[in-house]
Structure formats: C-alpha cells, structure tokens
Interface confidence: medium
C-alpha cells in the first residue's frame, strides 16, 4: 500500500470511558495534527476510515458498524459507542485518505468499570474553588454533543456516595453545582449523572471530578520571607560549615509561578567561584499555600566568604521581595595565658 503519514500512537490522549455508557470520540487528526477540519477534508473528497487493535493483540481489524442497535457508529469525525462494553478497550486508529493523500493516528481507549460509589481507575479532573469566596460553581464536564438541546436530561449530583440534597452549602442547579461558600470540608469527589432518552432507550453519563478548596485571591499577599530575618545572626569561624535557610511563604495564586533564589554579592551562586550548594524543599498547606525552603550551604567557609552579602529573593504573581542574611565572623575567644595576662599588666 502507498505511503501514509503515520502520527503513531498518541498516548497523550489516553481516553477513558465508563462501561455501559455512551461515548463519543473525535478523531484526533483534526484537533491536534492537521491544519484543516473534517468538513474541509470531506468536501475535498477525503474519506475517514476507522479501525482498531484489541487489547493484548497486534492485529489491526475493521470496526464492526453492523452491530445490533448500531452500538458502534460513525458520524462525521466522531466514533460513537451506544453504549461501551468492557472489551471495546484497545487502540483505535482514524485514517484520512484518498488516492493521493493519507494521514492516520492511533489512540488508546480504555473502558473502565466503576463501583456503586463511582470509584474507578478513571483519572479525575481537578476543579479548584477559592475558600470563603462567595458563590462558585462547577459544571458537569464533557457532556456536550450527546443529546440535542431539545432533549431535557435529568441530572443528579453526588458527593462520594451521597446524593446532594439539603447539603449545608451546596446546591444542585442542573448541569451546575453551586457552592454558596467553599470550605475545606467541601474537598472531595463530586459526580454528576446525566440521564437522557434516545430512540426509546435511556442512557446515563457519569462524570466525576475532584474539588479542591484553595486559598482565596482576596487573602493573597506578596511572598513573606520568614528566614533569614533580623533576629538571627549567622556567626561562624573560618573552616566551619555555613548553613542559611531561606524560608518563604507563598499565598495560593492560580497559575502563579513561585520562585526563590539566593544571590551572593549580587550574583547567582552558579556565577560565583565559591563551593556553594543549595537544597530546596516545598510543603503545602490544606489550601495549597506553599512554603519553600532553600538552604544555602558552604562546607568550609572562609573569612572572605563571611564578608559577602547573602540575599534571599522571592517572587510570585503578587510581587517580589528580598532579605539579606546577617553573616559575620566569630571573634575568637581570648587565649587566657597571653591576652588576659597582658590585660592585667603582667610583664
């Protein structure tokens, strides 16, 4: 057969769907690989062909579109399952071709089982809500295109196993779930079950997402440097190890890059000749506020090193701060026999 542009197995788009539920899967060619859409391709005389490789098999085979009740069908660039079965798991390929052009991509499809509490191996999207921020909403995800706007589905929301009814601060609003006030106790997995009729049959769509309550932008502050500070002086003798922690608190800020770095005499440690190492650790609070600690370490400090300026810097979307460490050379204790004796006027 003639050459075909093969984009390989697109593992970035690992598609997971629940067993015994409808699934509509768009051919990834038009979304991620080609610069034209299905309509353009179709009107140019290109044909979209689907085939698959079953789990643990190497053999590519055509998809059976003649199953009872059209269980698997193709509509434009979408492959439909009404509904899925466990053994539909495998690698699916969509190929766009005519006599002179060919392009194809494969992607993995995993049909997943869930228990009565919606637990499953499904990777869950995370939705972040700001703590104590006022009314916020989450929306039942990935249900577009399953039924026409004329169909009015029923939607039931659950937190874990429990149907959401008269919850303390959570109100179901159809496809939306409203949090009158988000609190840490609202952390958890929320599931919407969308039920709709189609051709005399009833289908269910189950969508679970994780809600994580995070720090509110109303409470966000610029980075706070806890250490170094004015109360601690790093007093060392030459030859000793110098350890200076830079500990910085960052308020949670959506999509903010938190940075901590040291400068020595105004230069980054990498740009200076002294033997310095820096170790970083990061911890998070329950609302995803972040504490970063960078420990600057000089194994055998010299008297030259003890005269240098050590400054901890921190930056977030809220601002940039810096704090110098107080470093000084320890004054050697007087040697009694000589210094003190001289002090008492001994000759």
């Amino acid at each position: 057969s003639e050459r075909c542009d093969d984009w390989g197995l697109d593992t970035m788009r690992q598609i997971q769907v629940f067993e015994d539920e409808p699934a509509r899967i768009k051919c990834p060619l038009f979304e991620h690989f080609l610069k034209f859409n299905y309509s353009t391709a179709h009107s140019a005389g290109l044909t979209l062909i689907w085939y698959w490789t079953r789990q643990d098999r190497d053999l590519e085979e055509p998809i059976n579109f003649r199953l009872p009740e059209n269980r698997i069908s193709k509509e434009k660039d979408v492959l439909w399952f009404r509904p899925t079965l466990l053994n539909d798991t495998g690698n699916y390929t969509c190929m766009l071709r005519n006599t002179t052009y060919c392009s194809k991509v494969a992607f993995p499809l995993e049909v997943v089982q869930k228990d009565s509490c919606f637990n499953s191996p499904m990777k869950l999207p995370v939705h972040k809500l700001y703590i104590e921020y006022g009314i916020q909403r989450i929306t039942c995800p990935n249900v577009d295109g399953y039924f026409p706007s004329s169909v009015k589905p029923t939607i039931t929301w659950y937190m874990g196993c429990y149907k959401i009814q008269n919850f303390n601060n959570v109100i179901p609003e159809g496809m939306n779930l409203s949090f009158l006030i988000a609190l840490i106790s609202n952390n958890g997995n929320y599931t919407c079950v969308v039920t709709y009729p189609e051709n005399g049959r009833t289908f269910h769509l189950t969508r679970t997402l994780t809600v994580k309550v995070v720090g509110s932008p109303k409470n966000a502050v610029p980075p706070v440097i806890h250490s170094p500070n004015d109360h601690v002086v790093y007093e060392k003798e030459p030859g000793e190890e110098l350890l200076i922690p830079c500990t910085v608190y960052f308020s949670f800020l959506m999509d903010s890059r938190n940075e901590v770095w040291w400068t020595i005499d105004g230069k980054k440690p990498d740009d200076i000749t002294i033997d310095v190492t820096i170790n970083e650790s990061i911890s998070h609070s329950r609302t995803e506020d972040e504490t970063r600690t960078q420990i600057l370490s000089i194994k055998k400090v010299t008297s030259e090193d003890l005269k240098r300026s050590y400054v901890c810097h921190a930056r977030s979307a809220k601002g940039e701060v810096a704090k110098a460490a107080k470093v000084k050379q320890k004054v050697p204790a007087p040697r009694y026999t000589v210094e003190l004796a001289c002090g008492f006027g001994a000759t």
Epitope: E132, Y133, G134, I135, R137, K152, P153, T154, I155, T156, W157, Q165, N166, F167, N168, N169, V170, I171, P172, E173, G174, N176, S178, L180, I181
Partner: antibody
Framework: QQLEQSGGGAEGGLVKPGGSLELCCKA??????????MCWVRQAPGKGLEWIGC?????????YYASWVNGRFTLSRDIDQSTGCLQLNSLTAADTAMYYC?????????????WGQGTLVTVSS | ALVMTQTPSPVSAAVGGTVTINCQAS??????LAWFQQKPGQPPKLLIY???TLASGVPSRFSGSGSGTEFTLTISGLQSDDAATYYC???????????????FGGGTEVVVK
C-alpha cells in the same frame, strides 16, 4: 426576557382568612429550565421586601423556603410550561402583600435579575 | 435566621452628590450579597450582585463593596432619577432541612434634593 404573573384575578386576590390562593409566574422569552430558579418575594403595603423561597426549575427537586414559612406555602414548577407557582394556604391578614416572582438573569441561586409585575393579595373577611 | 440591618433611612443628598448605604449581616455571608433599587409601584431592579459586580445595564455611578458582614452601596454623581428605595439581599451560606434564609435589609429611602 420577562416574567408574567397570574393568579387571584386581574384585580389581584381577595381571600378570606384561613383561605388559600395559587399564584403563578410564566417565563417568556427564555426557557425556565435554562434559567435555573424561580423565587418568590413579598412586600406588605408600605413595608420592605421579604424573601419567601426558591424552587429549582430544572430536572432536580431543589426547593428552599424561608424558615418563617413553616409549611404554609408551597412552591411548584412545570418545566414544559415554563411556569412556577406559589400555593398560599392558611392565610391571615398578615399575609396581605404584593407577591413578586423573580428569576436569576445571572448566575443561579441567590440572584434576582428578572421580576414579575407583582400580584396583590388581600386577606380580609 | 439571617438578619440584614440597613442604615441609614432615609438619606438625602443634592444632585451630583454622593450617597453611601450600609448593610450589616448577622452572619458571615462572604460576598453573597445583592443590591436592589425600587421605585413606587414597580418591582425591584437588580443593581449589584456578588457584593461588587455591576448588573448588566447599570450605570457605573453605582458601586458595591464589602464582604463577610459589612457591605456598602455607594451612589456617586447622584441624579434625580436615583430617588428610590434601596434594598440589600443577603444569601446565607448554610442550608438546613428546616429552611434556608435569604434575607432583605429593611430598605433605605434616598431623597434627591
């Protein structure tokens, strides 16, 4: 987008103490099911606004009442007719008021962007 | 039950002046507060929601601020058409099976001189 109120006749509702009355509110220019909530507020003559309750106008059965309602009033909705109703029972003279329906033109529960024209309910013997 | 206390009432100011109306919630309602304007014989009109977000079509002369239990509506560049009664509405954040409370303040009459 508007809310049209009905119930109690064109001149409003004159009801005897202990009596009942149903007020309804029809959404026109938008689908009630896509606008989520139908809420009710009343206003006694010369007084301020008083929240009665809200009913979700979609597929679930969320209904919330002010604690003072004590089961005397009932909210219902008919999605197909884009209508929400307020059933008033065991009425007393203190229930004499202008009754408004309101729906969120914004956001969902707790917002009242659209209002009906109001229906005056008079409880008198 | 949630109680919303509105002050002062009435309040008067000259055309072009500034009016500030306060609303205090008996519970922490975070930013779940709306402001309404009502003129005689008319239903209320939504001005502000989420404590500070201007509703569609409302002039920027109206502004809201506050969160928690203390809220303020400010009307600057007062116009004669602003003569009306103003109400705050708090959405309480705790729902219990025996009822939830959204509560209006008692109203503030604004007189334009």
């Amino acid at each position: 987008q508007q809310l049209e109120q009905s119930g109690g006749g064109a001149e409003g509702g004159l009801v005897k103490p202990g009596g009942s009355l149903e007020l309804c509110c029809k959404a026109s220019g938008f689908s009630l099911s896509s606008n989520y909530w139908m809420c009710w507020v009343r206003q006694a003559p010369g007084k301020g606004l008083e929240w009665i309750g809200c009913i979700y106008a979609g597929s679930s059965d969320s209904t919330y009442y002010a604690s003072w309602v004590n089961g005397r009033f009932t909210l219902s909705r008919d999605i197909d007719q884009s209508t929400g109703c307020l059933q008033l029972n065991s009425l007393t003279a203190a229930d004499t008021a202008m009754y408004y329906c309101a729906s969120p033109g914004y956001g969902g529960y707790g917002y009242y962007g659209l209002w009906g024209q109001g229906t005056l309910v008079t409880v008198s013997s | 039950a949630l109680v919303m206390t509105q002050t002062p009432s009435p309040v008067s100011a000259a055309v072009g002046g500034t009016v500030t109306i306060n609303c205090q919630a008996s519970e922490d309602i975070y930013s779940n507060l709306a402001w309404f304007q009502q003129k005689p014989g008319q239903p209320p009109k939504l001005l502000i929601y989420d404590a500070s977000t201007l509703a569609s079509g409302v002039p920027s002369r109206f502004s809201g601020s506050g969160s928690g239990t203390e809220f303020t509506l400010t009307i600057s560049g007062l116009q004669s058409d602003d003569a009306a009664t103003y109400y705050c509405l708090g959405v309480y954040t705790y729902i219990s099976p025996d009822g939830t409370d959204n509560a209006f303040g008692g109203g503030t009459e604004v007189v334009v001189k």
